[in-house]
């Protein structure tokens, strides 16, 4: 129950915290579970206990095993188990799954990758960062404190990121590396009551008899992928397909993503060879989603030829 997996590479420093944490200053005793042998507290030992921490400076493959920590109190001893595995260094670049820390996700707005377990170590900036074993270079990458910031994250930024730092113990330096996967996700979306950008409510659209006319219904529904969103035209409250006038057709426009990141849709109503009777119809631009429906009405009026010539 109070057990935690820890892993590291041979010849690197590994520091493990007792999974059964007490508060600072409580006495913590460490044992090697297989032999029940006490772990020494003297820092001259390669493996030694320091309060809640068990330090391997550096680690060896033979150190692998289960370690018991007991947080001592006269009325409430608490026992934890650290399952430690030390692996041989890989000769190739590939980092095996068993050496990977938890995957983190980032987006355009939040692209921090924290260096796993670094808070256990006595390290000084800067951290070195690698992606798929290549040192990260360029102004997009900024090593800041214990994390990496990537500017303008793109899907290509997904991959395995390794942080490398130096742990200092009494003047001696030990290397530590830790790797985790980074995935890029779309910014969290949201949905709003539809907002119709065009046409304006009760707009009068001037058309010329005998010519073609286009009406565009444009609405925005929120940010990111929308579960249900639609724009459409109605004629006198009837769907275009049911109205039965082949000269009047709607044609889906392109999905739009404006500079402010909103998810918007267009629907174009095409009227061929505008006739007098078309001026008597009520044209409704409808935008609907899970929040509800919004309607803007347009009427057609004949364009005055005099205005046209002027």
């Amino acid at each position: 129950k109070f057990s935690k997996q820890s892993w590291g590479l041979e010849n690197e420093a590994l520091i493990v915290r007792c999974p059964r944490q007490g508060k600072p200053s409580y006495t913590v005793d460490w044992y090697y579970s297989q032999t029940n042998k006490s772990i020494p507290t003297q820092e001259r030992n390669r493996v030694f206990a320091s309060g809640q921490l068990l330090k391997f400076l550096p680690a060896a493959v033979a150190d692998s095993g289960i370690y018991t920590c007991i947080v001592r109190s006269p009325t409430f001893n608490r026992t934890g188990y650290a399952n430690v595995t030390i692996y041989k260094k890989q000769s190739d670049c590939n980092v095996p799954d068993y050496l990977m820390y938890s995957t983190v996700s980032g987006s355009e707005k939040n692209s921090k990758i924290y260096c796993p377990t670094i808070d256990l170590y006595n390290w000084t900036a800067p951290l070195e960062w690698f992606k798929n074993c290549q040192a990260l270079q360029g102004s997009r990458y900024r090593a800041h404190k214990s994390f990496l910031v990537i500017d303008n994250v793109m899907t290509e930024d997904a991959g395995d990121y390794t942080c490398k730092f130096i742990h200092n113990e009494n003047g001696a330096n030990y290397s530590v590396t830790a790797t985790r996967s980074f995935t890029v996700k779309d910014e969290q979306g949201f949905s709003l009551f539809p907002v119709i950008g065009a046409p304006a409510q009760n707009e009068i659209k001037e058309v010329e008899i005998g010519k073609n006319a286009n009406l565009t219904c444009s609405a925005c529904f929120g940010k990111g992928t929308q579960f249900l969103a639609a724009v459409l035209w109605q004629l006198n409250g009837t769907k275009i397909t049911d109205f039965g006038e082949p000269r009047i057709q709607q044609e889906e426009g392109q999905n739009q993503s404006f500079s402010n990141g909103l998810a918007c849709l267009d629907m174009v109503l095409r009227i061929a060879d505008v006739k007098e009777e078309d001026l008597l119809l009520q044209y409704d631009c409808l935008a609907l989603n899970l929040h509800g429906l919004r309607r803007h009405t347009v009427r057609l009026s004949r364009k005055n030829p005099i205005d046209h010539h002027s």
């Epitope: 109070f2 200053s25 006495t27 001592r72 109190s73 006269p74």
Partner: antibody, heavy 117, light 111 residues
């Protein structure tokens, strides 16, 4: 954050049993820690009554051992105090709390209990 | 049972001055390098709040003007400089053995 919410009657008749409930949110009572009952008498004296650990083990103040029972309902994340054969001397404000190591780190709001006929 | 005796029972201190509260145990509460004495603050209508654990360790979020010291049977809580919000009753508590017991409390008032 661990939060403890107390409930139970404010008035108990002498010789009857006092029963209080502490509902814990933000942490499972079977995960770790000890879950205490403490009372504060009208003169402000504090008395630790006992606790039930995450494992189900109970520890009671010997002064109350014959009358006290601390139990729990893990499905509701609640623990309970039952104090039998109460007298007017048991009039106090009763607190539930959690002991992480040796100290009571989180407390309930307190329930004032009067023993009177 | 270990009996904890607090003194004084009440204390009046001017703003900005030092308040010193003592707690004496009927037997040693120290063992294996730790002293199992803790301090709480209680304001009217509220439950006690942990200030200091293991005699001298400041609980997370508690202002640094609170400090604790002592070992064996004699322990002290110091508040310096005393602020208005420190008006409260202070209790010591041990955890050396069962049953856990509390001191009778020291009421701190401000001049």
């Amino acid at each position: 954050d661990v939060q403890l919410q107390q409930s139970g009657p404010g008035l108990v008749k002498p010789s009857q049993s006092l029963s209080l409930t502490c509902t814990v949110t933000g942490y499972s009572i079977t995960s770790d820690y000890a879950w205490d009952w403490i009372r504060q008498f009208p003169g402000n004296k504090l008395e630790w009554m006992g606790y039930i650990r995450y494992s189900g083990d109970t520890y009671y103040n010997p002064s109350l051992k014959s009358r006290i029972s601390i139990t729990r309902d893990t499905s509701k994340n609640q623990f309970f105090l039952q104090l039998n054969s109460v007298t007017t001397e048991d009039t106090a404000t009763y607190y539930c709390a959690t002991t992480m190591m040796d100290t009571m780190d989180y407390w309930g709001q307190g329930t004032s209990v009067t023993v009177s006929s | 049972d270990i009996v904890l005796t607090q003194s004084p029972a009440s204390l009046t201190v001017s703003l900005g001055q030092r308040a010193t509260i003592s707690c004496r145990a009927s037997k040693s509460v120290s063992t294996s390098g730790n002293s199992y004495m803790h301090w709480y603050q209680q304001k009217p209508g509220q439950p006690p709040k942990l200030l200091i654990y293991l005699a001298s360790n400041l609980e997370s979020g508690v202002p640094a003007r609170f400090s604790g010291s002592g070992s064996g049977t004699d322990f002290t809580l110091n508040i310096h400089p005393v602020e208005e919000e420190d008006a409260a009753t202070y209790y010591c508590q041990h955890s050396r053995e069962f049953p856990l017991t509390f001191g009778a409390g020291t009421k701190l008032e401000l001049k």
